[in-house]
């Protein structure tokens, strides 16, 4: 029998200082461009080396921004994603939502790590 | 670095069927969107049609429902299916792999490009 993959999803806030690269990783995603069908979420692409959010740590490949400096990131076009990151000044705060694979067991039996029930 | 490699170029009638295959290796990210463009003589390079690595689909207007973008995340490749070709699909079609707008000093469109395959639609 094969396993369930599920998600663990965890909301974090992350505070990043801008680097001499900037705040050192990509995005993809926005209403003209969606990553994901039917979500027009903004999602980490990569994490340059050596920059600000390697540095940290925290941030990881795959994680939904949610927020830059509390303004909401829904709904909005790439570029306009874009410039808001570009105007937020030198303190960079960032609600994540990060997207765990949690490997549950054979279907119909209940793993340890399942929380249902 | 990133390398790609198109194949699957050639001189069809209209009317007739391609399918453009793109490889790609190097250090690509496991987030990423891959696509296909195009450029006639004397035209702009344009978007023809791009996948992402979460599943969303892109086309142009003017191939919608004659080609289909599909691709394989286990081999780093994307493929496009073009049925129906007319005379005005002739161009050199670029693959492209985009990982996304880097916010650095920049803020530039983070992507690489095939050396392109040429069809003909006689």
């Known amino acids: 029998m094969n396993g369930r993959v599920d998600y663990l999803v965890t909301e974090e806030e992350i505070n990043l200082t801008r680097g001499p690269s900037g705040l050192g990783f990509n995005i993809v995603g926005g209403t003209d461009q969606q990553y994901v069908s039917n979500d027009s979420g903004i999602y980490v692409s990569r994490i340059k080396e050596n920059g600000a959010a390697a540095l940290d740590g925290r941030l990881q490949e795959g994680d939904k921004i949610l927020s830059v400096n509390g303004q909401d990131l829904k709904n909005l076009l790439h570029q306009d994603a874009v410039d808001l990151f570009r105007n937020a000044g030198y303190a960079v705060s960032l609600r994540v939502q990060h997207r765990l694979q949690v490997q549950n067991g054979p279907i119909g039996h209940r793993g340890e790590g399942d929380p249902s029930g | 670095d990133v390398q790609l490699v198109e194949s699957g170029g050639g001189l069809v009638q209209a009317g007739g069927s391609l399918r453009l295959s793109c490889a790609a290796s190097?250090?690509?990210?496991?987030?990423?969107?891959m696509g296909w463009y195009r450029q006639a003589p004397g035209k702009q390079r344009e978007l023809v049609a791009s996948?992402?690595?979460?599943?969303?689909?892109n086309y142009a207007d003017s191939v919608k429902g004659r080609f289909t973008i599909s691709r394989d995340n286990a081999k780093n490749a994307v493929y496009l299916q073009m049925n129906s070709l007319k005379p005005e699909d002739t161009a050199v079609y670029y693959c492209?792999?985009?990982?996304?707008?880097?916010?650095?000093?920049?803020?530039?469109?983070?992507?690489?490009w095939g050396r392109g395959t040429q069809v003909t639609v006689s």
């Open positions: 996948i992402t690595s979460g599943g969303a689909t």
């Open positions: 190097g250090s690509i990210g496991s987030i990423n969107i």
């Open positions: 492209n792999l985009a990982r996304g707008t880097h916010l650095g000093d920049s803020f530039e469109r983070d992507d690489y």
